[in-house]
């Protein structure tokens, strides 16, 4: 806490500029008006104050409200956002995709921070869902926030936004919120053709259950093994040699060479010697 | 040991067809798959298509898919490939290949298809 | 399909240098399941047909000398020469077998001074 003290003359600031960095801390208190400082906030970002400096200001802004700042405050806060603590953002209400962005660019290549997930949290909860746009932006910074939702959290996820997705957003789901994604990515690009559906679905399918895996055998998709091995075990283990075959098209000769592995290693154990021979891969059933 | 045959040299007339053998021998025919490979003079290498040879079932690069036709013989343990049509863009060196999984693990000494007049 | 981008095209190296050649896919070869990247490297010499050196990107294939090393994992790729012998003469390429069509790169001349 710093210590009320007036201030000396002639060093009241008239606005927020490079001379306020040579202010000590107690003339920053004493000089700054709080009011001032917050309808000129877009300005504190181009002024390289100490983190000391930072403080105050801060200081400042918390007694000028003390129930939780203004969009209009918060949207310019720049640099001073790294130095807010997860219970001031939980007194905000940040309603703009603008105000959103600002923030995340100042904490741009850093892991997400105990701030930055608070704040995204007010922010999708204020919401109510997680829109196309705001999940546009938030993979646009965190390529794995899909994945670090719950799937009770995913469930709020309209189907609509599901276009926003990209493959690598899902690199690190699991399969029970692959389980959540699947049946609104089927819903999302339900009225797209056979190829196209495919190349939209694929990043799903580790939700997908065996007869929609069933039915996609049958229309030439031409599966990789990398997304094949992503699938449900149990998704997979009742398809037929037949089945495995036409959905992975030329890829099934790799189950060769990832025979040791799940699922592919429990899929071969369920099948009959005579058909996996007619695979032409010498697998051992 | 594992040995892939192909004759040395195919010469033909442009619109013309060929038909490439690949003779297997060292291993058991049906448990590996065969692939096609082309090389034109001093370019890379260009993946034409991979056969099954226990079903027979053959899949194609979309570029490839008109021009060539992939075919065994279990019988004789002899891989094929019809390449019909053919213009000076198919004088190339083409490769048989056996797999070893994924990747190409044994390659046949290829045979040089000349297209002239 | 799937670029693969091979660098330099062309080297010159002596006798018992190391080297190192680049190839970079335009999408990750590696199956986050099993670990492997669908990755192998050939050397193919003068006159010959190629022959493979290295598969899920840093598996040597059996017979091949231990000087040769594969390293690199998603989308970017090395094969290194320890120590570069007279009969290392030829041209390196690497090809993706994730996702047909399998695709090479447009390979890695080494020329010997």
């Known amino acids: 806490e710093v210590e009320k003290t007036a201030c000396p003359s002639g060093k009241k600031a008239p606005e927020i500029d490079e001379s306020l960095i040579f202010y000590k801390k107690w003339e920053l208190e004493a000089c700054v008006d709080a009011a001032l400082l917050a309808t000129q906030m877009d300005r504190v970002n181009a002024i390289p104050f100490t983190y000391e400096q930072l403080d105050v200001l801060k200081h400042k802004l918390d007694e000028l409200y003390p129930q939780g700042y203004p969009e209009s405050v918060i949207q310019h806060l720049g640099y001073l956002f790294l130095k807010m603590s997860p219970e001031d953002i939980r007194k905000w209400n940040v309603t703009s995709l603008e105000t959103l962005k600002a923030l995340l660019e100042v904490n741009k290549g850093h892991e997400m921070s105990p701030q930055v997930a608070t704040l995204i949290d007010r922010f999708v909860k204020g919401r109510g869902q997680l829109d196309k746009d705001t999940l546009d932006t938030l993979t646009a910074f965190y390529p794995g926030y899909l994945c670090s939702l719950s799937p009770e959290e995913l469930s709020s996820v309209p189907p609509s936004s599901i276009w926003a997705v990209r493959p690598q957003d899902l690199d690190t789901c699991d399969p029970r919120q692959l389980d959540v994604l699947y049946p609104k990515a089927r819903l999302a690009f339900q009225n797209m053709n056979g190829s196209e559906y495919f190349v939209k679905i694929q990043s799903f399918l580790g939700g997908a259950p065996t007869e929609d895996l069933k039915a996609l055998s049958q229309q030439n998709v031409s599966m990789d093994l990398a997304t094949f091995m992503k699938l449900r075990t149990d998704a997979v283990l009742p398809l037929t040699v037949a089945e495995v075959q036409k959905l992975l098209g030329p890829h099934v000769e790799g189950l060769k060479a990832e025979e040791r592995h799940r699922p592919v290693r429990d899929w071969i154990l369920r099948q009959r010697q005579d058909d996996l021979d007619t695979l032409g891969l010498g697998l051992q059933g | 040991q594992v040995q892939l045959q192909q004759p040395g040299t195919e010469l033909v007339k442009p619109g013309a067809s060929v038909k490439l053998s690949c003779k297997a021998s060292?291993?058991?025919?049906?448990?590996?798959?065969m692939h096609w490979v082309k090389q034109r003079p001093g370019q890379g290498l260009e993946w034409i298509g991979n056969?099954?040879?226990?079903?027979?079932?053959?899949y194609y690069n979309e570029r490839f898919m008109s021009k060539a036709k992939m075919t065994v013989d279990k019988s004789s343990s002899t891989a094929y490939m019809q390449l019909s049509s053919l213009t000076s863009e198919d004088s190339a060196v083409y490769y048989c290949?056996?797999?070893?999984?994924?990747?190409?693990?044994?390659w046949g000494p290829g045979t040089l298809v000349t297209v002239s007049a | 399909d799937i670029v693969m981008t091979q660098s330099p095209s062309s080297l010159a190296m002596s006798v018992g240098q190391k080297v190192t050649m680049s190839c970079k896919s335009s999408?990750?070869?590696?199956?986050?399941?099993?670990?492997?990247?669908?990755l192998a490297w050939y050397q193919q010499k003068p006159g010959q047909s190629p022959t493979l050196l290295v598969y899920?990107?840093?598996t040597r294939e059996s017979g091949v000398p231990d000087r040769f090393i594969g390293g690199g994992s998603g989308t970017d790729f090395t094969l290194t020469i320890s120590s570069v012998q007279a009969e290392d003469l030829a041209d390196y390429f690497c090809?993706?077998?994730?996702?047909?069509?399998?695709?090479f790169g447009g390979g890695t001349n080494l020329e010997i001074k």
């Open positions: 290949a056996r797999s070893g999984g994924l990747w190409l693990a044994f």
């Open positions: 060292g291993y058991t025919f049906t448990n590996y798959w």
């Open positions: 056969i099954n040879p226990s079903s027979g079932d053959s």
């Open positions: 999408q990750t070869l590696l199956n986050s399941v099993s670990q492997n990247n669908y």
């Open positions: 899920f990107a840093s």
């Open positions: 090809q993706q077998h994730y996702r047909t069509p399998y695709t």
